[in-house]
């Protein structure tokens, strides 16, 4: 946030940039939290734009019985590994096809025991305030589907009739990691010493980090004809004086007509 300065007074302004603002030869360059000619004003809204998507990663192990393990499968650049990866990915894409959050699989390790496949199932959802519930539900469906397929697609008489066959007892979910996004925490951190006065409000499922000085939200402070200004003790209304009135009160809602006051004084004189 910048304010340009022209003329002789600029040199004085340079040394007066406040709140960590820096002079660039023309104006005070203000840090994120401040604006104004001298960076003296606190912003009323902070961009905490959430990520467009939130991801989750499930660490799973399955045992593939329809492929005989060979040492080449340990080498991720081998023809054997690449082919296994392709077939396994295709099979998992079929297994998880009904899960909108499913992105794909990533094999981390293949080891002996038929072929034990250590892999990650990758999930992603569009950010909404309910993202945790959405991803929790998706991880449950992943568990159900992999359990089902590894129970149904099994070798019969040492032969597999499916694209891949599995050992029913070899399926394990090791760990589930969900990318954490906490707008309230982000808002508090970015508001720094004003953190107590900034809150998160949602509009169209998007979080906004605002102080009561930001108009149009349920926490917005109505200063009437005055100006809302944030200080370390919280939001305050700076009341204006017009040609005809003085305004006062916590929300500048008390107007005193100047003529009455002047008239009163004049009367005393």
């Amino acid at each position: 946030r910048t304010t340009t300065c022209f003329g002789d007074g600029c040199q004085n302004t340079a040394s007066r940039c406040k709140n960590g603002g820096t002079w660039d030869g023309l104006k005070c360059q203000c840090p994120n939290l401040y604006y104004g000619e001298l960076c003296e004003e606190v912003v009323s809204s902070i961009d905490i734009g959430p990520p467009e998507t939130i991801s989750a990663q499930m660490e799973l192990t399955v045992t593939v019985t329809s492929v005989k393990f060979t040492e080449e499968l340990k080498n991720h650049s081998s023809q054997e590994f690449q082919e296994f990866k392709q077939t396994f990915t295709e099979q998992m894409n079929i297994v998880y096809s009904g899960i909108p959050e499913y992105v794909g699989v990533n094999i981390t390790k293949l080891r002996l025991g038929s072929v034990v496949v250590e892999h990650d199932v990758l999930l992603r959802t569009k950010y909404t305030p309910e993202y945790k519930t959405v991803l929790d539900n998706a991880t449950e469906v992943v568990k159900e589907k992999i359990t089902k397929v590894t129970t149904q697609q099994i070798m019969i008489n040492d032969i597999c009739s499916d694209m891949m066959c599995f050992n029913t007892t070899g399926t394990q979910v090791q760990n589930i990691t969900v990318t954490q996004y906490d707008p309230e925490e982000d808002c508090r951190k970015m508001a720094k010493e004003y953190g107590d006065y900034f809150v998160v409000e949602y509009r169209d499922q998007k979080p906004y980090c605002i102080s009561p000085c930001e108009p149009g939200f349920s926490v917005s402070k109505n200063c009437n004809l005055g100006k809302c200004q944030m200080s370390l003790s919280g939001p305050q209304c700076l009341c204006v004086t017009t040609e005809t009135h003085w305004y006062s009160g916590e929300t500048c809602n008390q107007g005193t007509q100047k003529s009455l006051v002047y008239g009163h004084h004049h009367h005393h004189h």
Partner: nanobody
Amino acid sequence: EVQLVESGGGVVQPGGSLRLSCAASGYTSNRYSMAWFRQAPGKEREVVAFIWTDGGRTYYADSVKGRFTISHDNSKNTLYLQMNSLRAEDTAVYYCAASSLLLQTINPRAWPYWGQGTMVTVSS
């Protein structure tokens, strides 16, 4: 990239014999799986037989057991299918398939590499 070229198809009378060949190229290892599948008009592709080139395993579909023999010549990288006592129901396009893995599945979707097919017609 693995490439497969079949040959040996043709017209034969019931009870007759044919030998199909499939030349493979592009393998980095001498241990892999090869198979013969077939597809009759209007039917799904089905396995006939498969073999591991290290000699570790062979498999035959019940319908061809005792009549067909699958083999592999490592020095020539060639797969064979010796078909004896042929029947009318053996009429189909025969495909050679391969995998760099030691597969134990008869599902065609598990086999990534395919030849163009050779026609076998058993008719009197």
